[in-house]
Amino acid sequence: SEVEYRAEVGQNAYLPCFYTPAAPGNLVPVCWGKGACPVFECGNVVLRTDERDVNYWTSRYQLKGNFYKGDVSLTIENVTLADSGIYCCRIQIPGIMNDEKFNLKLVIKPAKVTPAPTRQRDFTAAFPRMLTTRGHGPAETQTLGSLPDINLTQISTLANELRDSRLANDLRDSGATIRIG
């Protein structure tokens, strides 16, 4: 079953996916595709990495996290209703039948009509993430980043902007908890 994520038309959508490299910089191939994870690779690939870098991507699809630490979360910029659907993150880990495959469901909602446009916020940069990862070694929890100096009004504004996101329920815990695997 897929984990569901939401974004509005015109926003950036964020689909989390992480692994723990066996050693710093010891990366493995990862692909993102539109459609559930198949047997080989990803279907309809939108982004692919190798053991060194991103080696294939299409417009609007980016990795904005720390790729070298195993953050291969996908950002889709300026989403449209056509971006709705299942996305596959596949981490091709060495060993026998070790691949991590995650199917994430992205739901795009029509943009809310507001009197004045609000500045887009990229919540991947605004909040720290507590993540439980599975990969080469045992699961571990790590915190990336720290809570920036923002006032309560900003937090309230962000909470409103993100209320349809799975992250919204965790704002009061001063960070979003994402558990994959």
Epitope: V28, G43, R48, D50, Q92, I93, G95, M97
Partner: antibody, heavy 120, light 107 residues
Framework: QVQLQESGPGLVKPSQTLSLTCTVS??????????WSWIRQHPGKGLEWIGY???????YYNPSLKSRVTISVDTSKNQFYLKLSSVTAADTAVYYC????????????WGQGTLVTVSS | EIVLTQSPATLSLSPGERATLSCRAS??????LAWYQQKPGQAPRLLIY???NRATGIPARFSGSGSGTDFTLTISSLEPEDFAVYYC?????????FGQGTKVEIK
């Protein structure tokens, strides 16, 4: 264009280990996008995927054979290998090595196949 | 594992006729279905992948359709070299599985 060639004994005794080699030319076995696979076809019957190995070291085996099969690779020789232990007459088949290419337009390359008979 | 059932088992047609082959999956395979052609003494040859995409070098007379559990391979006008066995294969779920094949023979 990638070419594959199977080699190994055509006759194996029951309970022994079947060992086959696939030699790849026209492409590097350590390049991404290719799933180096073994597939077999019992005489007059359908096809069965045995397993694959990817350049990352990711390996998948058919659950029906998992306890008996090993697929490995030697990048320096541009070869990959199949070992199937404790064979019986039911393992008599044409064994193909194949490469499924999934980057860009999907395509595949197959060896010509080698018949392995399990008999005493 | 996912079971693929092909029908008919044998199709007897003449050159120039249209061939329609069916493949049904025991559960949804989305669009992750391929069609292969195999001639006696040869390895299979990929014709169609992801239900409807022709592989490199495959003539336009071969087309595929369907999604979920029901798929069709159509050969619009049979050429003499098209008489062979055709297999469908899913790559939705491990292990990849093949149908039992449809033999297209000369009537």
């Amino acid at each position: 264009q990638v070419q594959l060639q199977e080699s190994g004994p055509g006759l194996v005794k029951p309970s022994q280990t079947l060992s086959l080699t696939c030699t790849v030319s026209g492409g590097s076995i350590s390049s991404g996008g290719y799933y180096w696979s073994w597939i077999r076809q019992h005489p007059g019957k359908g096809l069965e995927w045995i397993g694959y190995i990817y350049y990352s070291g990711s390996i998948y085996y058919n659950p029906s054979l998992k306890s008996r099969v090993t697929i490995s690779v030697d990048t320096s020789k541009n070869q990959f290998y199949l070992k199937l232990s404790s064979v019986t007459a039911a393992d008599t088949a044409v064994y193909y090595c194949a490469s499924l290419m999934v980057w860009g337009v999907m395509g595949d390359y197959w060896g010509q196949g080698t018949l392995v008979t399990v008999s005493s | 594992e996912i079971v693929l059932t092909q029908s008919p088992a044998t199709l007897s047609l003449s050159p120039g006729e249209r061939a329609t082959l069916s493949c049904r999956a025991s559960q949804s395979v989305s669009s992750y279905l391929a069609w292969y052609q195999q001639k006696p003494g040869q390895a299979p040859r990929l014709l169609i992948y992801d239900a409807s995409n022709r592989a490199t070098g495959i003539p336009a007379r071969f087309s595929g359709s369907g999604s979920g559990t029901d798929f069709t391979l159509t050969i619009s006008s049979l050429e003499p070299e098209d008489f062979a066995v055709y297999y469908c294969q899913q790559r939705s779920d491990w292990p990849p599985t093949f149908g039992q094949g449809t033999k297209v023979e000369i009537k």
